[in-house]
């Protein structure tokens, strides 16, 4: 399946909006700095399967969607912004959706993509816990958006090496 | 708020498949993965796998592998899990559960569905 | 498999009393991955807590719950009438997931 450009630009899209999206200087909130651990031997160009790297985007991506749709989170964000990100998301999803189908039918997932599924899900679970313990403060939110744009920004370079593998 | 509403129960007979449905609202229902888990009488819980409703992919226990096939209509918001081969063991209620991250794990469940399988 | 045992299988209290409930690993779980459910006759599991120590919304704060590793524990401080019911330990930790068999709490 080849993931559309317009995918590659709505991914950028989204990165520009989170970047946008920053309210607070994160230099004031080094002391929330957290390891969240970020899954990147599920997304490696080295030894990942096209079908498990495309799973583990619309998982990212799902999550991501998710975890920015909640009450606390709408409280955090400029509303506009929020908007046009859930737009974004919303569209890497249809994307994704027909490339997950695409690659393996609506068969079973292989074993090897059950587990970069549940790493990226895992991932996400650090995440609500570390938001949820610092009760969803804005430098909480800030370090999370942070970690976000980098998981972002390393998969977008992934999609990118995706292509050319194609 | 979240429901998840499943079909009625169901008597088989040995060899027969049985198709159950879990019918959600109050969310969005291609967000977030639906799982499945039997609990035989008076036995303890058992997770039989999970659909992502968004498109459609599984993930199975091994141990219903060859038997278990879930499934999703996006129109109806409804999940469904189909046993076949059945025997006097898959005599259980089986419960839909959504998925979800830190409290929302499993938050919801569906009111359970007894299927009976009697010769 | 990630086999959970629960223990006792049954324990015997009065209300006021302090219940404790254990729940043991085959193999590490982190503690992220670890819930409990309690389940009521005729009724489906309702979360109790979250994570090996969170109490889930609506839960009140007699529940507690800890450990880490391959040994965690729910705590009841003071047990109330409502209180007698199966509790079951769960692990989302690996594929498949898991349910400890069950400990059922019940009045002496």
């Known amino acids: 399946c080849d993931l559309p450009q317009t995918h590659s630009l709505g991914n950028r899209r989204a990165l520009i909006l989170l970047a946008q999206m920053g309210r607070i200087s994160h230099f004031s909130c080094l002391k929330d700095r957290y390891d969240f651990g970020f899954p990147q031997e599920v997304f490696d160009g080295n030894q990942f399967q096209k079908a498990q790297a495309i799973s583990a985007f619309h998982e990212m991506i799902q999550q991501t969607f998710n975890l920015f749709s909640t009450k606390d989170s709408s409280a955090a964000w400029d509303e506009t912004l929020l908007d046009k990100f859930y737009i974004e998301l919303f569209q890497q999803l249809n994307d994704l959706e027909a490339c997950v189908t695409q690659e393996v039918g609506v068969e079973e997932i292989a074993l090897m993509n059950e587990d970069s599924i549940l790493a990226v899900r895992k991932y996400f679970q650090r995440i609500t816990l570390y938001l949820m313990g610092k009760k969803y403060s804005p430098c909480a939110w800030e370090v999370v958006r942070a970690e976000i744009m980098r998981s972002f920004s390393f998969s977008t370079n992934l999609q990118k090496g995706l292509r050319r593998k194609d | 708020q979240v429901q998840l509403v499943q079909s009625g129960a169901e008597v088989k007979k040995p060899g027969a498949s049985v198709k159950v449905s879990c019918k959600a609202s109050g969310y969005t229902f291609t967000n977030y993965w639906m799982h499945w888990v039997r609990q035989a009488p008076g036995q303890g819980l058992e997770w039989m796998g999970e659909?992502?409703?968004?498109?459609?992919?599984?993930i199975y226990n091994e141990n219903f592998k060859s038997r278990v096939t879930m499934t999703r209509d996006t129109s109806t918001s409804t999940v469904y899990m189909e046993l076949s081969s059945l025997r006097s063991e898959d005599t259980a209620v089986y419960y839909c559960a959504r998925g979800g991250l830190g409290p929302a794990w499993f938050a919801y469940w569906g009111q359970g569905t007894l299927v009976t399988v009697s010769s | 498999e990630i086999v959970l045992t629960q223990s006792p299988a049954t324990l015997s209290l009065s209300p006021g009393e302090r219940a404790t409930l254990s729940c043991s690993a085959g193999s590490s779980v982190d503690s992220s991955y670890l819930y409990w459910y309690q389940q009521k006759p005729g009724q489906a599991p309702r979360l109790l807590i979250y994570s090996t120590s969170n109490l889930a919304s609506g839960i009140p704060a007699r529940f507690s719950g800890s450990g880490s590793g391959t040994d965690f524990t729910l705590t009841i401080s003071s047990l109330e009438p409502e209180d007698f019911a199966v509790y079951y330990c769960h692990q989302w930790s690996s594929y498949p997931f898991t349910f400890g068999q069950g400990t059922k709490l019940e009045i002496k």
């Open positions: 659909i992502n409703p968004s498109h459609g992919r599984t």
